[in-house]
Interface confidence: low
């Protein structure tokens, strides 16, 4: 008799993939066009990244530290109207991409939560989600928790009002905390939340660091869906040197729990590379001539329309990745193992019962490494076979789909290695 | 009127790190970006690196590991530090400011610093 | 980086002549979306910094006299003093903005006969 199939998980949709931020509706669009219906313009362009959701703005109307200027219900007119925004839904529920709106209330001031006055903001917020939720989002993001005064209370009554009005619907918080119990006494108090954090950017890029921050993580919150990411807003470029961008997106999109980008980190986007260009919010390069102040500093490698040409860049790696994170059951919602695998190397297992496998092997170092696989570290429920088929590298070269010896697994420096094998009764 | 001077000492040893100071007039920091360019004695001039309006920095790859440049808006300073100084960092150090036309920044300098001698030597 | 070459590196001319001297880039400085060349001319005095006289390759500074012209394209510029004064004597450096970092000409120094 065929073992028993073991029982799906509840799956939400934030759970199916990657999310995508878009802070900085000008930046993302360029050439002063940055508003709702030209971001309606470009969701084909999310669609073809597979992502599952678009966290957008704030866009409201946010008169800098003036409370009493800041209204959670208006639309800035700098980026459209009410009108836009609904445009903005059909159009994006039609293509399956969900929208959470960004309700940091004081966005453009010095404190994202106004330095006073924090019962009348918490009611403005309150106010916001009842509001927006009857319009048709899917969910929210409050920015910069950690300037908010009792966030804990405050998260657990928004997260009340936006479960009460259906299980569908998101709340994500973004802290530019790294310190773990921090992040734990803020997800202990709330259930179900989406926590965004600086968590991850001081990996110092290394194998054995990042597979203990990745560890100590998941060990901490149990059987929570977690979000990856390596702040609650800014690029991976922030944080990455360019060699271990492909690396970080490997890891990101393989990891148990929701994925989530900022525009540009799909192509590597660098404000160091564009002069005069906020490190926050830099322009995104669509061509070469989405930055005409300095000619010649974008050249068409950098941008989505020269890597969308090219089957090797970073683009077409998160595409990829993006659509097995949405496909297999094991990215989905499988079961996590990491172990041993020599000096300067992350290594795990994502399984769900008799799916097919996955194994991850990153080369955090920048020096090739032979890989000493410690299958002892392992449950039986996860063993590993003598041989696993490359379904990608990070790397150019490696010739896809043939099958490698584990035992001989030799990997380039900063190079990602995603294998996988079928289910051995 | 715009006005920019460089201030700093005017030796240093072998090793050591150099300070210069760039005090602005007449021009905010919060909009205009300002480089430093060096020129050995009598030798022609090398673009250093620039501190833009937003408070981002490049510098020139051959400098790139010993170079910081930074600024306080409050007291219109920019400040160039390089570490590691040799007998070949001996130069006239000039700030100047990197013209800015409203939207754009492009890599001319129309303000330059009346700049400062800096000689290494033990 | 984009290496910039003068020529000559110096030049002894008498007050009222015509002078011209070249400058020349590793890749072109043309940038097609605008037309423009991303190059800039500028006079140093013996003791002094640096002035700028060019920018746009032949676009000259407020206050320039207009005896200095710029001209050329692409990879090929020349700065031309239509008629020498003795205060023109000086070390002139063409420099490219096109590409990072911004480099410099060696320069052509201008001399008295």
């Known amino acids: 008799r065929a073992p028993r199939c073991r029982e799906l998980p509840a799956q939400k949709w934030w759970h199916t993939g990657a999310l995508y931020r878009i802070g900085d509706l000008q930046a993302f669009q360029g050439h002063g066009a940055g508003n709702l219906a030209g971001l309606k313009g470009r969701l084909d362009y999310l669609s073809s990244l597979k992502v599952k959701g678009l966290v957008l703005g704030p866009i409201h109307k946010n008169q800098k530290d003036d409370v009493a200027q800041t209204d959670l219900l208006q639309i800035d007119p700098n980026f459209g109207s009410k009108e836009d925004f609904d445009s903005l839904l059909q159009s994006a529920k039609k293509k399956s991409i969900r929208v959470i709106l960004d309700l940091t209330p004081n966005y453009r001031g010095e404190n994202s939560w106004f330095s006073t006055q924090v019962d009348t903001v918490a009611t403005k917020v309150k106010d916001a989600l009842e509001f927006w939720l009857q319009a048709g989002v899917d969910g929210f993001q409050v920015r910069d928790i950690e300037n908010l005064k009792d966030a804990s209370s405050f998260l657990a009554e928004w997260q009340n009002i936006t479960k009460g009005f259906s299980e569908d619907r998101l709340l994500i918080a973004g802290t530019n905390s790294s310190d773990l119990q921090q992040i734990l006494s803020l997800l202990e108090s709330n259930k179900d939340l989406l926590l965004t954090s600086s968590y991850l950017s001081d990996s110092g890029s290394t194998g054995e660091h990042t597979k203990s921050l990745v560890t100590q993580y998941l060990n901490a919150t149990g059987n929570r869906w977690c979000s990856w990411s390596l702040s609650q807003a800014r690029l991976l470029t922030s944080f990455l040197p360019a060699q271990l961008l492909r690396l970080y997106q490997l890891m990101l999109f393989t990891l148990p729990g929701t994925p989530v980008f900022s525009y540009g980190d799909e192509i590597g986007l660098d404000a160091a590379a564009l002069p005069g260009q906020p490190m926050e919010a830099p322009v995104m390069l669509w061509d070469e001539s989405s930055f005409p102040d300095i000619p010649g500093a974008v050249s068409a490698n950098m941008t989505v329309k020269g890597q969308s040409e090219d089957p090797g860049s970073l683009l077409s790696l998160f595409r990829r990745l993006s659509d097995q994170r949405s496909k297999e059951r094991s990215l989905l919602h499988g079961d996590f193992h990491a172990f041993s695998a020599g000096p300067g190397l992350f290594s795990y297992i994502r399984h769900w019962d008799q799916n097919e496998r996955f194994l991850v092997v990153l080369n955090f170092g920048d020096v090739g490494l032979s890989a000493g696989l410690q299958a002892s570290d392992l449950p039986a429920s996860a063993s590993l076979p003598a041989k696993a088929d490359l379904l990608l590298s990070t790397q150019p070269g490696r010739e896809e789909g043939s099958p490698l010896e584990l035992e001989r697994l030799k990997l380039e420096p900063h190079e990602g290695l995603l294998l996988r094998f079928p289910y051995a009764a | 009127q715009v006005q920019l001077k460089e201030s700093g000492p005017g030796l240093v040893q072998p090793s050591q790190t150099l300070s210069l100071t760039c005090t602005v007039s007449g021009f905010s920091l919060s909009t205009y970006g300002v480089i430093w360019v060096r020129q050995p004695p009598g030798k022609g001039l090398e673009w250093m690196g620039v501190?833009?309006?937003?408070?981002?920095?490049n510098y020139n790859s051959t400098l790139k590991s010993r170079l910081s440049i930074s600024r306080d808006t409050s007291k219109s300073q920019v400040y160039l530090k390089m570490n590691s100084l040799q007998t070949e960092d001996t130069a006239t150090y000039y700030c100047?400011?990197?013209?800015?036309?409203?939207?754009?920044?492009?890599?001319?300098?129309?303000?330059w610093g009346q700049g400062v001698m800096v000689t290494v030597s033990s | 980086d984009i290496v910039m070459t003068q020529t000559p590196s110096s030049q002894a001319v008498s007050a009222g002549e015509k002078v011209t001297m070249n400058c020349k880039s590793s890749?072109?400085?043309?940038?097609?979306?605008?037309?423009?060349?991303?190059l800039a001319w500028y006079q140093q005095k013996p003791g002094q910094s640096p002035k700028l006289l060019i920018y746009w390759a032949s676009t000259r500074e407020s206050g320039v006299p207009d005896r200095f012209i710029g001209s050329g394209s692409g990879t090929d510029f020349t700065l031309t003093i239509s008629s020498v004064q003795a205060e023109d004597l000086a070390v002139y450096y063409c420099?490219?903005?096109?590409?990072?970092?911004?480099?410099f000409g060696p320069g052509t120094k201008l001399e008295l006969k």
């Open positions: 100047a400011r990197h013209y800015y036309d409203g939207t754009y920044y492009y890599g001319y300098f129309d303000y």
């Open positions: 501190i833009w309006a937003n408070g981002n920095t």
């Open positions: 420099q490219q903005y096109y590409y990072f970092p911004y480099t």
């Open positions: 890749q072109s400085l043309l940038y097609s979306e605008n037309k423009k060349n991303y």
